[in-house]
C-alpha cells in the first residue's frame, strides 16, 4: 500500500492514520472506522469513506431524463458493512436488525426488511448521472470548454479513465455528467465510477477528501463554476426491487446538496 513515503501521509484520503509499519516497512495508511489499509495512490472506496465518516456524517432536450429505475440516495448517511476489499456488502443492516440490499455505490435498492432478507449479489451501478445547477453567471459557459474542463477534472483529480466519462450535457444553468462503467469494462486498477462520483460530490460540497489540497476550484476559461445544487442518479445493471408505492413516488424523493 503506497503513500507519500517522506512523511507518511495519504494524499488521496485525509480520513486515515498513517504509520511506517506496513509490509516491507513501508508507510501504511488505515481508514478511520474500519482500520483497513488503503492504497493511497488511488481513490479510497466509498464504503470505507462512509464508514470513516460515521466514525469521525422538455422536448428536443439535450439533457438526460433519468429512467424509471434511477435511484437517488434518499437514506442519507449510515455506517456500512464493507467486505475485505472495502466494497459494500450486498446486505446492510442497522442496529435494530432492519436490513436492505444495496448496489455497488451503497444506495438502497430494495424495501427494508428483517434479518431474513437475502441479497444474493452486489448489483453493479453501471451508469451515474450527476445533475448540477450552477450559480448565475454573466453568460452561459461555452459547452465544449465546459466539457473539456469536467473531463480533465475527472481524469486528473479523480484518476478516472476518460472512456468512463460518457457525456457532458449543458443547458444553462444545468450541467449533467454521465459516467458509465459496466462490469466487463472495469479492469483491475481502474477507478470505480461510484468512487469518483463520491469524491466529486464531496468536493462540490466543500468537503474535499484529499489530504492537504485546497478545495475544488472549478474554472472554465478562468470563469468560476460555482455549483448551487447537486443531484445524483444511480442506475444499476439489474433494476431495483421496490414495492409499487415506492416506485410510483420515487422521483419526488430528490436528495439535494447545497
Amino acid at each position: 500500500h503506497t503513500a507519500a513515503q517522506d512523511n507518511c501521509t495519504c494524499p488521496t484520503n485525509k480520513m486515515t492514520v498513517c504509520s511506517p509499519d506496513g509490509p516491507g516497512g513501508r508507510c501504511q495508511c488505515r481508514a478511520l472506522g474500519s482500520g483497513m489499509a488503503v492504497d493511497c495512490s488511488t481513490l479510497t472506496s466509498k464504503c470505507l469513506l462512509l464508514k470513516a465518516r460515521m466514525s469521525a456524517p422538455k422536448n428536443a432536450r439535450t439533457l438526460v431524463r433519468p429512467s424509471e429505475h434511477a435511484l437517488v440516495d434518499n437514506d442519507g448517511l449510515y455506517d456500512p458493512d464493507c467486505d475485505p476489499e472495502g466494497r459494500f456488502k450486498a446486505r446492510q443492516c442497522n442496529q435494530t436488525s432492519v436490513c436492505w440490499c444495496v448496489n455497488s455505490v451503497g444506495v438502497r435498492r430494495t424495501d427494508k426488511g428483517d434479518l431474513s432478507l437475502r441479497c444474493d449479489e452486489l448489483v453493479r451501478t453501471h451508469h451515474i448521472l450527476i445533475d448540477l445547477r450552477h450559480r448565475p453567471t454573466a453568460g452561459a459557459f461555452n459547452h465544449s470548454d465546459l466539457d473539456a474542463e469536467l473531463r480533465r477534472l475527472f481524469r486528473e483529480r479523480y484518476r478516472l479513465h476518460p472512456k468512463f466519462v460518457a457525456a457532458v450535457h449543458y443547458e444553462q444553468p444545468t450541467i449533467q455528467i454521465e459516467l458509465r462503467q459496466n462490469t466487463s469494462q472495469k479492469a483491475a486498477g481502474d477507478v470505480d465510477i461510484g468512487d469518483a462520483a463520491y469524491y466529486f460530490e464531496r468536493d462540490i460540497k466543500g468537503e474535499s477528501l484529499f489530504q492537504g489540497r485546497g478545495g475544488l476550484d472549478l474554472r472554465v476559461r478562468g470563469e468560476p463554476l460555482q455549483v448551487e445544487r447537486t443531484l445524483i442518479y444511480y442506475l444499476d445493471e439489474i433494476p431495483p426491487k421496490f414495492s409499487m408505492k415506492r416506485l410510483t413516488h420515487h422521483h419526488h424523493h430528490h436528495h439535494h446538496h447545497h
Epitope: V17, S19, P20, D21, P23, G35, M36, A37, P84
Partner: antibody, heavy 115, light 107 residues
Framework: QVQLVQSGAEVKKPGASVKVSCKAS????????IHWVRQAPGQGLEWIGT????????VYNQKFRDRATMTADRSISTAYIELSRLRSDDTAVYYC????????WGQGTTVTVSS | EIVLTQSPATLSLSPGERATLSCRAS??????IHWFQQKPGQSPRLLIK???ESISGIPSRFSGSGSGTDFTLTISSLEPEDFAVYYC?????????FGQGTKLEIK
C-alpha cells in the same frame, strides 16, 4: 533500542478502576500505534484496543468500549489504559505493544481483581 | 470480526523434527497475519510479520507462508527452546484478533 516499560502489578477490588502505564523509548513515540492486549491466567491473548499517539485517535474492541479508556501523553512518551468497573474476570496480565504487528512488547502488568 | 482458527491445538514433536502450524482466517485478509511465540511467564515475541517477512534476530529455521485465508508457520528443525505456545494475529482491519494458540510440546 526500542523499549516499552510498564507500571507495576496492581490489586483491585471489584467495581474499582485501574490505570496501567506504558513508557516508550528508543523510537519516535508519535508515529507508531500502541496496542493493549491482555491475557487471563492460562488463556490466550485478547486485543483490547489501540491508540495512535500523534493525534490520540483510539479504537476499542467492542467488548471493552464502555469500560476502557486509552490515552497518550506525548510529552513523556507514555501510553495509558484505564479499565473501570473491574470484575474478577478482568484478572489478567495487561501488555502494551508497538505497531500493527506488535514488534515490541512491554513486560506486562499483572492486575488482580479480588474482594 | 475476523476469526482466526489455529490447528492443531497441541502438537507433540521431538527436537530435530519439522513443525507445521496452521492459522485459518474467517475471511480474506491478504497477508496481514503475524506469528508470535510465548513461553511461560514471558511476553510474546514476534517471529514473522505479514505472513512471510522475517524478523531481525529470529533464527532462520522459522518461516511463514500463505495469503488470503490460509497461513502456515514452519519450524524447519526443532530446537529444545522452540517448545512454547504459538499465536497468529491479524492486522487486516479492526478489531485485531488472535488465534487461540497452538501448544508445541516435546514428544
Amino acid at each position: 533500542q526500542v523499549q516499552l516499560v510498564q507500571s507495576g502489578a496492581e490489586v483491585k477490588k471489584p467495581g474499582a478502576s485501574v490505570k496501567v502505564s506504558c513508557k516508550a523509548s528508543g523510537y519516535s513515540f508519535t508515529t507508531h500505534w500502541i496496542h493493549w492486549v491482555r491475557q487471563a491466567p492460562g488463556q490466550g491473548l485478547e486485543w483490547i484496543g489501540t491508540i495512535f499517539p500523534s493525534n490520540a485517535y483510539a479504537v476499542y474492541n467492542q467488548k471493552f468500549r464502555d469500560r476502557a479508556t486509552m490515552t497518550a501523553d506525548r510529552s513523556i512518551s507514555t501510553a495509558y489504559i484505564e479499565l473501570s468497573r473491574l470484575r474478577s474476570d478482568d484478572t489478567a496480565v495487561y501488555y502494551c505493544a508497538r505497531a500493527s504487528y506488535f514488534d515490541y512488547w512491554g513486560q506486562g502488568t499483572t492486575v488482580t481483581v479480588s474482594s | 470480526e475476523i476469526v482466526l482458527t489455529q490447528s492443531p491445538a497441541t502438537l507433540s514433536l521431538s527436537p530435530g523434527e519439522r513443525a507445521t502450524l496452521s492459522c485459518r482466517a474467517s475471511q480474506n485478509i491478504g497477508t496481514s497475519i503475524h506469528w508470535f511465540q510465548q513461553k511461560p511467564g514471558q511476553s510474546p515475541r514476534l517471529l514473522i510479520k505479514y505472513a512471510s517477512e522475517s524478523i531481525s534476530g529470529i533464527p532462520s529455521r522459522f518461516s511463514g507462508s500463505g495469503s488470503g485465508t490460509d497461513f502456515t508457520l514452519t519450524i524447519s528443525s526443532l530446537e529444545p527452546e522452540d517448545f512454547a505456545v504459538y499465536y497468529c494475529q491479524h492486522s487486516h482491519s479492526w478489531p485485531f484478533t488472535f488465534g487461540q494458540g497452538t501448544k508445541l510440546e516435546i514428544k
